[in-house]
Amino acid sequence: VPGEAEQPAPELVEVEVGSTALLKCGLSQSQGNLSHVDWFSVHKEKRTLIFRVRQGQGQSEPGEYEQRLSLQDRGATLALTQVTPQDERIFLCQGKRPRSQEYRIQLRVYKAPEEPNIQVNPLGIPVNSKEPEEVATCVGRNGYPIPQVIWYKNGRPLKEEKNRVHIQSSQTVESSGLYTLQSILKAQLVKEDKDAQFYCELNYRLPSGNHMKESREVTVPVFYPTEKVWLEVEPVGMLKEGDRVEIRCLADGNPPPHFSISKGNPSTREAEEETTNDNGVLVLEPARKEHSGRYECQAWNLDTMISLLSEPQELLVNYVSDVRVSPAAPERQEGSSLTLTCEAESSQDLEFQWLREETDQVLERGPVLQLHDLKREAGGGYRCVASVPSIPGLNRTQLVKLAIFGPPWMAFKERKVWVKENMVLNLSCEASGHPRPTISWNVNGTASEGDQDPQRVLSTLNVLVTPELLETGVECTASNDLGKNTSILFLELVNLTTLTPDSNTTTGLSTSTASPHTRANSTSTERKLPEPESRG
């Protein structure tokens, strides 16, 4: 066309897909009458009439734009609705009078792509591949024009690098005219890339300027052979018998190799394989001193049949042996002395303590307890505790009972018991002494005897309350090789005055109701009488 070279550059109108493009005819009054204009679209250098303006009234031509065009701004502007990528072309308006002039508008269409979708290669990448392998694929859907992709590793952009990094991008045009971009990152990875974060970034333009969208970060499985194998023990620190101990085999390869854990047998100098759980962890629960020893881990790379061995790890399960006390069953005369010695073995230094069993009072810190001028009250339990101060909870104890020779010693001298006539009464009598005494009663009834401990005995008697019994009371006599001793139980009939609420003499009353030959509560509490004299 003659003179076309002198044509000014078209006016640029930028618009997003789906919105309305306002095409303003820029002809001046001198160039043409805007009340008489023809609008054309130019595609592949072919003009197509799409809209006429006559006396300020607009009329669409049949075709692809028929439903989407309208006049605005008193006829100076053509509005194109629902813009699509196919609308990216030149539009021109041509005035008819006084002479034919035209004004060109370049419509540029934009559409932000969707969030990029990144998919990592699920099969992973071996580190010593000969050429770059597929790391991840990035897909950006429905953008216009084609967005640019940039790949990042640990926040740094990746550039094409011969035999190291290769980025392979392709695009498809959807029926909508929008582009879907697919970019494949191929790279040769090293072991250090096992934790590397990869992501892709789509750069695109909108009428408002340049924009970008980032994918999520992904890590790719990187495969590399094991070079080092080692053992870890949990818990860390000092172990003791009874602990739950886990011995775990670890390797620096991916995937992890096949493991076995062995314990050295000192007598055979051979490593005996231990049974591990499904995760290759050896669990010692509860740990015992026999678990102490040298452990090592063997790892097999089945791809190469190479076997690797860890450095051996010494495991020490600390223990305290059974505690031995000598003499084990001490017997002494009153006034004599006694030396108790405590022994135990341990993997660590031991501390010993002697405690009185009945009171938990610490008597001695050390393995030897010396007792002098023994009294009858010194009889009873003594406990030796062997402990490892550096390992809380690691201790063992042994109880020894000291017996002091002496005649029977009664729990009470006299006692008053409240009774009702014809009730069956349960009476008890307790005595201690060494040798252990036996107890007899001065009345007929059913008696039973039980050991409280080696020096103490309790006898119970079931007896029918009769007038004679009320008269005489009941005696129990304890005897051993060294003598005898007696306790008296006085029986008193219950009457209403003794049952007043504030009475303090009713504690000996059986809770059973009195009826002929009914049995009273066999453990009725009994109130002791004042005992100014010595017990026993």
């Epitope: 010593n128 000969k130 052979p225 062995s262 051979e270 394989e273 790379n301 190479i306 690797l308």
Partner: antibody, heavy 120, light 112 residues
Framework: EVQLVESGGGLVQPGGSLRLSCAAS????????MSWVRQAPGKRLEWVAT????????YYPDSVKGRFTISRDNAKNSLYLQMNSLRAEDTAVYYC?????????????WGQGTMVTVSS | DIVMTQSPDSLAVSLGERATINCKSS????????????LAWYQQKPGQPPKLLIY???TRESGVPDRFTGSGSGTDFTLTISSLQAEDVAVYYC????????FGQGTKVEIK
């Protein structure tokens, strides 16, 4: 018949590089673990490198780790040993070996070897 | 690393006589689970590459004459040639594969 033929040996200066090749035939190369073993003059045998059948796993002793790289091209039935930063103590006959189907690491088949001399 | 030590360094035996080569490992090579030792024996004749004789300490490779016998367990192993033949003149190497791979220094067998 299993055949392993090494090539690429020769004289090289300390610090230099050399690439050994091993052409395999008579078996399905891509199914077997391959290794290099060397023998210095008058010395004991020394394992140098092992590669898995697919090439994804490689192993080396500390004496060559970081300097030597074993690789394979299953399409070409070839095994390679790239040797960099060569030292006088790397002087040896280098043998290409093939494992067998046992559950233990053995060098069941050996090539005739290629001589590498590192000297100034 | 596991160190393999062979004894003697060389051995001269009359034809038809028994030859015994020892190999000692610095640690046990026995896998207690499968009850097998990770030890192999190789024969290297002059001017030739080595040849596999025995693996798992006592399993003879196919084609190896039955006069070659491997024995031992743990740390001490023996290769016995029950009746030495002229073609048995060679250097014999033991090799462990319990932790990576290491060879013994070799034992040279000659005819007396």
């Amino acid at each position: 018949e299993v055949q392993l033929v090494e090539s690429g040996g020769g004289l090289v200066q300390p610090g230099g590089s050399l690439r050994l090749s091993c052409a395999a035939s008579g078996f399905t190369f891509s199914s077997y673990i391959m290794s290099w073993v060397r023998q210095a003059p008058g010395k004991r045998l020394e394992w140098v490198a092992t590669i898995s059948s697919g090439g994804s796993s490689t192993y080396y002793p500390d004496s060559v780790k970081g300097r030597f790289t074993i690789s394979r091209d299953n399409a070409k039935n070839s095994l390679y040993l790239q040797m960099n930063s060569l030292r006088a103590e790397d002087t040896a006959v280098y043998y290409c070996t093939r494992d067998d189907d046992y559950d233990v690491k053995v060098f069941a088949y050996w090539g005739q070897g290629t001589m590498v001399t590192v000297s100034s | 690393d596991i160190v393999m030590t062979q004894s003697p360094d060389s051995l001269a035996v009359s034809l038809g006589e028994r030859a015994t080569i020892n190999c000692k490992s610095s640690r046990s090579l026995l896998n207690s689970r499968i009850r097998k030792n990770y030890l192999a024996w190789y024969q290297q004749k002059p001017g030739q590459p080595p040849k596999l004789l025995i693996y798992w300490a006592s399993t003879r490779e196919s084609g190896v004459p039955d006069r070659f016998t491997g024995s031992g367990s743990g740390t001490d192993f023996t290769l016995t040639i029950s009746s030495l033949q002229a073609e048995d003149v060679a250097v014999y190497y033991c090799k462990q594969s319990y932790n990576l791979l290491t060879f013994g220094q070799g034992t040279k067998v000659e005819i007396k």
